[in-house]
């Protein structure tokens, strides 16, 4: 740092004064010197370092008419909005010839009410769940003692006796306000008031109660909600065949979820209009007057298989002597599961019914009993899944096949009543 030399008498006739004030204060430091000849530029030092970007003004007044006469030079340093970084020892510095002169020091101090570096923030917390709040204040003057208040009631018997920078709250059962007071020798400052909103806890134990092909009944255990009763719970279901995002823990499903609201209690809901034999992910959140809980994790569930909703289509049945050829197409109606195969039943007028499991083929050749003289032979076909048989087609009569003719196609549908099966010699 530049140092003054004592070889010549200092040109300074006025030195900087002292400023002590609170944050935000505006003040001016002033020094004055009298020199002979060309007036020098006045520099300002803070704690021995030249202030390169000082907000200073310099005024020069000649005391005579000749340039070589004496000049009065006044430099003023303006400090706007006093901050901690402005504090320190201030001096003026001039270079005169080969010599450096430094004024006597003036001091800038900061002293006022405590200043908050950190204040408690608004937040939501689940009922009866621990959380922390932060508050930090500084002087000068130090020390600064904190006193936390909850709903305007002090949480300690005196400032500096309770938690200081961090307040640990073991849990709340009602929405509350928190603030902190900062005390120092100059007075008290109160922080902003943070509102801590108590929401219901996340529901627990989301599980399936019963499953049907197009509906699921689910139940859950509600979390605590403090003094605020739950008003309703919301259940979301999303198809999970493209739900890799859910598996990877993404917060939102890849498509618009199906949303249902449940009045509570009971904490149970029947989700309808679902696809059979389809994987879903479901989650639930519950709401009180204060707002909703967080969602549960996505729970993978699956609707069970159902039976096919319609019979096979386009059944044709032709007879050629003791052989009959039957073929059909997959039902147009929803299968409600994985098609495992077809059952076929045929029966003559006075003969017992014969039942066959055809598997997944869509045609079959039947070897008829005897010489094929059985009259009024009819055939029915049903598709089946793991859940059971779908409706049977209406009986299709076996028609004699004439070469060159197209085989007849029957689209009649039989009521979905199960035939009275018998197990003949077949």
């Amino acid at each position: 740092a530049p140092r003054g030399t004592q070889a010549e008498e200092s040109p300074f006739v006025g030195n900087p004064g002292n400023i002590t004030g609170a944050r935000g204060l505006t003040g001016t430091l002033r020094c004055q010197l009298q020199v002979q000849g060309e007036p020098p530029e006045v520099h300002w030092l803070r704690d021995g370092q030249i202030l390169e970007l000082a907000d200073s003004t310099q005024t020069q007044v000649p005391l005579g008419e000749d340039e070589q006469d004496d000049w009065i030079v006044v430099s003023q340093l303006r400090i706007t909005s006093l901050q901690l970084s402005d504090t320190g020892q201030y001096q003026c510095l001039v270079f005169l010839g080969h010599q450096t002169f430094v004024s006597q020091p003036g001091y800038v101090g900061l002293e006022g009410l405590p200043y908050f570096l950190e204040e408690p923030e608004d937040r939501t917390v689940a009922a009866n769940t621990p959380f922390n709040l932060s508050c930090q204040a500084q002087g000068p003057p130090e020390p600064v003692d904190l006193l936390w208040l909850q709903d305007a009631v002090p949480l300690a018997t005196a400032p500096g006796h309770g938690p200081q920078r961090s307040l640990h709250v073991p849990g709340l059962n009602k929405t509350s306000s928190f603030s902190c007071e900062a005390h120092n020798a100059k007075g008290v400052t109160t922080s902003r008031t943070a509102t801590i909103t108590v929401l219901p806890q996340q529901p627990r134990n989301l599980h399936l109660v019963s499953r049907q092909p197009t509906e699921l009944e689910v139940a859950w255990t509600p979390g605590l909600s403090g003094i605020y009763p739950l008003t309703h719970c919301t259940l979301q279901a999303v198809l999970s065949d493209d739900g890799m995002g859910i598996q990877a823990g993404e917060p939102d499903p890849p498509e618009e979820p199906l949303t249902s609201q449940a009045s509570v209690p009971p904490h149970q809901l029947r989700l309808g209009s679902l696809h059979p034999h389809t994987p879903y992910h479901i989650r639930v959140a519950c709401t009180s007057s204060q707002g909703p809980s967080s969602w549960t994790h996505w729970l993978p569930v699956e609707t069970p298989e159902g039976v096919p909703l319609g019979p096979p289509e386009n059944i044709s049945a032709t007879r050629n002597g003791s052989q009959a050829f039957v073929h059909w197409q997959e039902p147009r109606a929803p299968l409600q599961g994985t098609l495992l195969g077809y059952r076929l039943a045929y029966q003559g007028q006075d003969t017992p019914e014969v039942l066959m499991d055809i598997g997944l083929r869509q045609e079959v050749t039947l070897e008829l009993q005897g010489d094929g003289s059985v009259s009024n032979l009819t055939v029915c076909v049903a598709a089946y899944t793991a859940a059971g048989d779908g409706p049977w087609s209406l009986p299709v009569p076996l028609e004699a096949w004439r070469p060159g003719e197209a085989q007849p196609v029957h689209q009649l549908v039989k009521e979905p009543s199960t035939p009275a099966f018998s197990w003949p010699w077949w």
């Epitope: 020390p143 003692d145 018997t157 005196a158 400032p159 006796h161 309770g162 008290v188």
Partner: antibody
């Protein structure tokens, strides 16, 4: 720097009221809490009570019926009054900020006729 | 009222010794505990606040520990100027209560 100074009579007659004043310099009594503690000769410390920056008070229940702490913010002073004193109230009386960073030097009050 | 029981009531030790003073509260005081040193004819001096926090200007040979209802003041290496009486204070509840004191004397 912060200084606290107790003042008041060193001798009080039994059944009379003990009155002490604590003058604070370097710290505004409109901040923090300010208390009185006493120590009978050769014995331990006993908390008497405090006055808060806003003027509310808290007293030791064992003395509550006899004690009053008040303040004069214009003089930056707070005071202790203890009524109906007996020889058992003979003690060194200290004033202090309740964080206990700063104490008065203490004043001995003897209760004797 | 919360009772504060300090032990021992007195102890004799030599310079350089490690000294431990304990304070037991009649209930959980959640670290609302201060330790003081008092020399004859002087006001007490704050050593520790919040059970563990060293007050400004107090030598690091002093330390506080504990939680719940049991607290300890430790002087790691006793110095000549440490011979004094030590008090604990609970400020969890009103009335604030002091321990009865521990006098540390020269052996």
């Amino acid at each position: 720097q912060v200084q606290l100074q107790e003042s008041g009579p060193g001798l009080v007659k039994p059944s009379e009221t003990l009155s002490l004043t604590c003058t604070v310099s370097g710290y505004s009594i409109t901040s923090n809490y300010w208390g009185w503690i006493r120590q009978p000769p050769g014995k331990g410390l006993e908390w008497i009570g405090y006055i808060t920056y806003s003027g509310s008070t808290s007293y030791n229940p064992s003395l509550k019926s006899r004690v009053t702490i008040s303040r004069d913010t214009s003089k930056n002073q707070f005071s202790l009054k203890l009524s109906s004193v007996t020889a058992a109230d003979t003690a060194v009386y200290y004033c202090a900020i309740t964080t206990f960073y700063y104490w008065g030097q203490g004043t001995l009050v003897t209760v004797s006729s | 009222d919360i009772q504060m029981t300090q032990s021992p009531s007195s102890l004799s030790a030599s310079v350089g010794d490690r000294v431990t003073i304990t304070c037991r509260a009649s209930q959980d005081i959640g670290n609302y505990l201060r330790w003081f040193q008092q020399k004859p004819g002087k006001a007490p001096k704050l050593l520790i606040s919040g059970a563990t926090n060293l007050a400004a200007g107090v030598p690091s040979r002093f330390s506080g520990s504990g939680s719940g209802s049991d607290y300890t003041l430790t002087i790691s290496s006793l110095q000549p100027e440490d011979f004094a009486t030590y008090y604990c204070l609970q400020s969890k509840e009103s009335p604030w209560t002091f321990g009865q004191g521990t006098k540390v004397e020269i052996k």
